[in-house]
């Protein structure tokens, strides 16, 4: 029996009975949050051989081994992963060994085995026999191997039953438990699986088989399963499904979506039966089972039940991620937030059409509306009282609506209203009237020239750059000395600069009123000599990098006791000079004959210019006599270690302590202070652990159903 679309067993261990007849779980298997220690010995699911997605175990009290539960689990396909992992064993307080002695293949993804205080038999499993790559495996914070004393079958009797492999230069026996070896196939089978009797399976088999060289006797299929046979590709008129089997059109048409009962059904695309069209494609009609490429971003219609969606935080904006058409009204009320502009752009930046009205009020955190970077049409099918479809009220820091030189926005019906936006220049509003086609709709009361822009430099003169000089990591710029009507009103200048690979930045990019700003800022005092032009040396820049730079004058001048008069430059794009590139990465050399070396490398991470060629130098080295002096059979001293307790806040010491002359005596010395690189690596590691744990908690803790 195929079970699915994913099985979540939590709180009550008796729910395990749901697995009774499963041979394949088409989806994931979660076993988690069973806090009462139970006796699992009566539960055994020998039929289960394949999980198509991932296996997650988390906080299951009393479970000591997985071997009795899933004695025949052979393949975890990893078609969909849990945070890049196909097997996650996390905070299993009583688990003593994994024990999945028939697990032969994890097709995709890595494993994460973490914070299992009692878990042993980890160093005895050779994961490279099960996974293609072991570098992404994360096995941390479990019972220290030195405390485990893992012994493979027969070792005590000096009749070892298991085979040996090398892991980290250590050649040792491989087993899952004290009485179960890790199965290995003869080298003659190559990448193929084998039977219990070490006969090679058919190439299309994966994990194991019941008879040699027979594509109908596979435990699991390397590619696809169809009508009892493992096939390299699905036959004509059948389609790949869930990454492991072939189904016909009728099957695909009749699948009910797990996510929602009112979804449009599955589609067939590129030979696969899938829940929805892939990125860049859209259904060819609402009832169609086929996909066509989108022109530009694919439309995604989002609707708000209550008609009006209030965006008052990043969390509420998240609900609109990917939406291109919003059916309803948007009420934006962002009073505070961290890095709000870029977060909002991330979640709302694809919206092209709003069918109702847009209202922005009390959004003191906003400096610009450019986070709605694709908004091109407000239909105004529903309007606010007074027939407004665009309403902007009391936004204390709003300075820019959009960059109208690069923006087409149409307001099909309804008027605009602007009031109490002290930093929003009225000229910016009138420009919006022109662009949006609302000119003439607004009345005198809709755009108040007194309470919009009264605290902004709306009357801006243009500052002109007079010179620019560059080196590999410096830019020197000067500009004309600005002379406002009253010279005493000029306080200073502020220079804004940032990396700009493309010439498309605006003054308000990534800026919000809560301190986030993608621009670096430097204050420049007025030169005391009135004949000297102001300027600045920007240093610490990257070589061969284009920067955007602009300058603002900071003034006090008022126009007729009304608006502040200021001055700023256009945005200047300037590239630093080229420099010596950083070292080429990942240099590898290997000899393929007695007279040749093959050397490979990756380009430098910082080319600092356009790379034109590489220089390869080599020289003959005398052979090192030390290689002959060292006894490779001798065991190193056992490392001093701190013991883990199932948490991973304690640093594990695995290197041998240095023994040198210290203070005139021989004896162990203090550990050398950590290098910056080591500290940084530790910091990143801790951060990575937190991110995973947050992901785990967010994924599995869900509100109790009503």
């Amino acid at each position: 029996e195929i079970c699915g679309p994913g099985i979540d067993i939590r709180n009550d261990y008796q729910q395990l009975k749901r697995l009774e007849n499963c041979t394949v779980i088409e989806g994931y298997l979660h076993i988690l949050l069973i806090s009462k220690a139970e006796d699992y010995r009566s539960y055994r699911f020998p039929k289960l051989t394949v999980i198509t997605e991932y296996l997650l175990l988390f906080r299951v009290a009393g479970l000591e081994s997985l071997g009795d539960l899933f004695p025949n689990l052979t393949v975890i396909r990893g078609w969909k992963l849990f945070y890049n992992y196909a097997l996650v064993i996390f905070e299993m307080t009583n688990l003593k060994d994994i024990g999945l002695y028939n697990l032969r293949n994890i097709t995709r993804g890595a494993i994460r085995i973490e914070k299992n205080a009692d878990l042993c038999y980890l160093s005895t499993v050779d994961w490279s026999l099960i996974l293609d790559a072991v570098s992404n495996n994360y096995i941390v914070g479990n019972k220290p191997p030195k405390e485990c004393g893992d012994l493979c079958p027969g070792t005590m009797e000096e009749k070892p039953m298991c085979e040996k492999t090398t892991i980290n230069n250590e050649y040792n026996y491989r087993c899952w438990t004290t009485n179960r070896c890790q199965k290995m196939c003869p080298s003659t089978c190559g990448k193929r699986a084998c039977t219990e009797n070490n006969e090679c399976c058919h190439p299309e088999c994966l994990g194991s088989c019941s008879a040699p060289d027979n594509d109908t006797a596979c435990v699991a299929c390397r590619h696809y399963y169809y009508a009892g046979v493992c096939v390299p590709a699905c036959p004509p008129n059948t389609y790949r499904f869930e990454g492991w089997r072939c189904v016909d059109r009728d099957f695909c048409a009749n699948i009910l979506s797990a996510e929602s009962s009112d979804s449009e059904g599955f589609v067939i695309h590129d030979g696969e039966c899938m829940q929805e069209c892939p990125s860049g494609f859209i259904r060819n009609g609402s009832q169609s089972m086929y996909c066509i490429p989108c022109e530009g971003p694919c439309p995604k219609v989002c609707e708000e039940e209550k008609k009006t969606k209030t965006i008052d935080s990043v969390t509420s904006a998240q609900m609109l991620q990917g939406c291109t058409i919003f059916k309803g009204n948007l009420l934006i009320n962002i009073r505070r937030g961290n890095n709000i502009a870029s977060e909002l752009e991330n979640f709302m930046g694809l919206i092209e059409v709003v069918t109702g009205y847009v209202k922005i009020r009390h959004s003191h955190a906003l400096v610009s509306l450019s986070f709605l970077k694709n908004l091109r049409l407000i239909l105004g099918e529903e309007q606010l009282e007074g027939n407004y479809s665009f309403y902007v009220l009391d936004n204390q820091n709003l300075q820019q609506l959009w960059d109208w030189d690069h923006r087409n926005l149409t307001i099909k019906a309804g008027k605009m209203y602007f009031a109490f936006n002290p930093k929003l220049c009225v000229s910016e509003i009138y420009r919006m009237e022109e662009v949006t086609g609302t000119k003439g709709r607004q009345s005198k009361g809709d755009i108040n020239t007194r309470n919009n822009g009264e605290r902004a430099s709306c009357e801006s003169d243009v500052l002109h750059f007079t010179s620019t000089t560059t080196s590999k990591n410096r830019i020197i710029i000067t500009w004309h000395r600005y002379r406002p009507p009253d010279y005493r009103d000029l306080i200073s200048f502020t220079v804004y600069y940032k990396e700009a690979p493309f010439k498309n930045v605006t003054e308000y990019d990534g800026q919000d009123a809560c301190g986030s700003n993608s621009w670096n800022m430097v204050d420049v005092d007025l030169p005391p000599n009135k004949d000297v032009e102001p300027g600045i040396l920007l240093h610490g820049l990257k070589p061969w990098t284009q920067y955007a730079v602009y300058v603002k004058a900071v003034t006090l001048t008022m126009v007729e006791n009304d608006h502040i008069r200021g001055a700023k430059s256009e945005i200047l794009y300037i590239r630093t000079n080229a420099s010596v590139p950083s070292i080429p990465l990942d240099v590898l050399s290997a000899s393929n004959s007695s007279s040749q070396l093959i050397v490979k490398w990756n380009p430098p991470s910082l080319p600092n210019g356009n790379l034109s060629y590489y220089i390869v130098r080599w020289q003959r080295q005398p052979q090192d006599g030390y290689l002959y002096r060292h006894n490779y059979c001798s065991k190193d001293k056992i490392p001093i270690r701190k013991y883990a307790d199932g948490t991973i806040d304690i640093e594990e010491v695995t290197e041998n302590p240095k023994t040198e002359v210290c203070g005139g005596e021989k004896g162990p010395c203090c550990a050398c202070p950590k290098t910056e690189a080591e500290k940084q690596a530790e910091k990143e590691e801790a951060e990575y652990r937190k991110v995973f744990e947050n992901f785990l908690h967010n994924s599995i803790f869900v509100p109790r159903p009503e």
Epitope: S427, G445, R450
Partner: antibody, heavy 119, light 112 residues
């Protein structure tokens, strides 16, 4: 005290272009007000022609829109009216004025200049 | 366009007596911000118009308190509590709610 002064030819030939300038003194044209033109044919009522903001944004009376251009010159603190393809019906006293958002109304008017369209 | 209709066309008055002028608009001049966008202007003989009342009922700077404006929605009234000889001229109402701004036809106030 803001003062407005219209200037321009008092006689324009039919089908020609009427051009008037309004000089603003006692205040900046860059303040947050709209600068308007209003006309009054002899013995008749007032007709609003259009207005301009210092940023260059304009609003025109739809009945005249195809023939009217209002522009601003901030450096000279003045704004101008051009009315093309004039006929005798365009004969009127032309006033420049300021629509204020302080008092929310046309609070300052020029003294007006009579423009006659005649051959 | 919003059509403004004034009555009467002509109003002979006696100095010291009250006077009242009516103005009706073809649509409500009440804005959603609560203000009524109606102004009253007086054009004395041979002069430019001058602002008397703005936003329906607010007296402009320097305007004597014998002038008052009232009304809401579409019906408005300018009252002069005691007419003085210098009050003669043509009185215009003007709406500023919708573009284009439009004036009433005017009411000529003259001494009997």
């Amino acid at each position: 005290q803001v003062q407005l002064q219209e200037s321009g030819p008092g006689l324009v030939k039919p089908s020609g272009t009427l051009s008037l300038t309004c000089a603003v003194s006692g205040g900046s044209i860059s303040s947050s007000n709209w600068w308007s033109w209003v006309r009054q044919p002899p013995g008749k009522g007032l007709e609003w022609i259009g207005e301009i903001y210092h940023s260059g944004s304009t609003n025109y009376n739809p009945s005249l829109k195809s023939r009217v251009t209002i522009s601003v010159d901030k450096s000279k603190n003045q704004f101008s009216l051009k009315l093309s393809s004039v006929t005798a019906a365009d004969t009127a006293v032309y006033y420049c004025a300021r629509y204020s958002y302080g008092t929310v109304g046309i609070d300052y008017w020029g003294q007006g200049t009579l423009v006659t369209v005649s051959s | 366009d919003v059509v403004m209709t004034q009555s009467p066309l002509s109003l002979p008055v006696t100095p010291g007596e009250p006077a009242s002028i009516s103005c009706r608009s073809s649509q409500s001049l009440l804005h959603s911000n609560g203000y009524t966008y109606l102004d009253w202007y007086l054009q004395k003989p041979g002069q430019s118009p001058q602002l008397l009342i703005y936003l329906g009922s607010n007296r402009a700077s320097g305007v004597p308190d014998r002038f008052s404006g009232s009304g809401s929605g579409t019906d408005f009234t300018l009252k002069i509590s005691r007419v003085e000889p210098e009050d003669v001229g043509v009185y215009y109402c003007m709406q500023a709610l919708e573009m284009p701004l439009t004036f009433g036809g005017g009411t000529k106030v003259e001494i009997k």
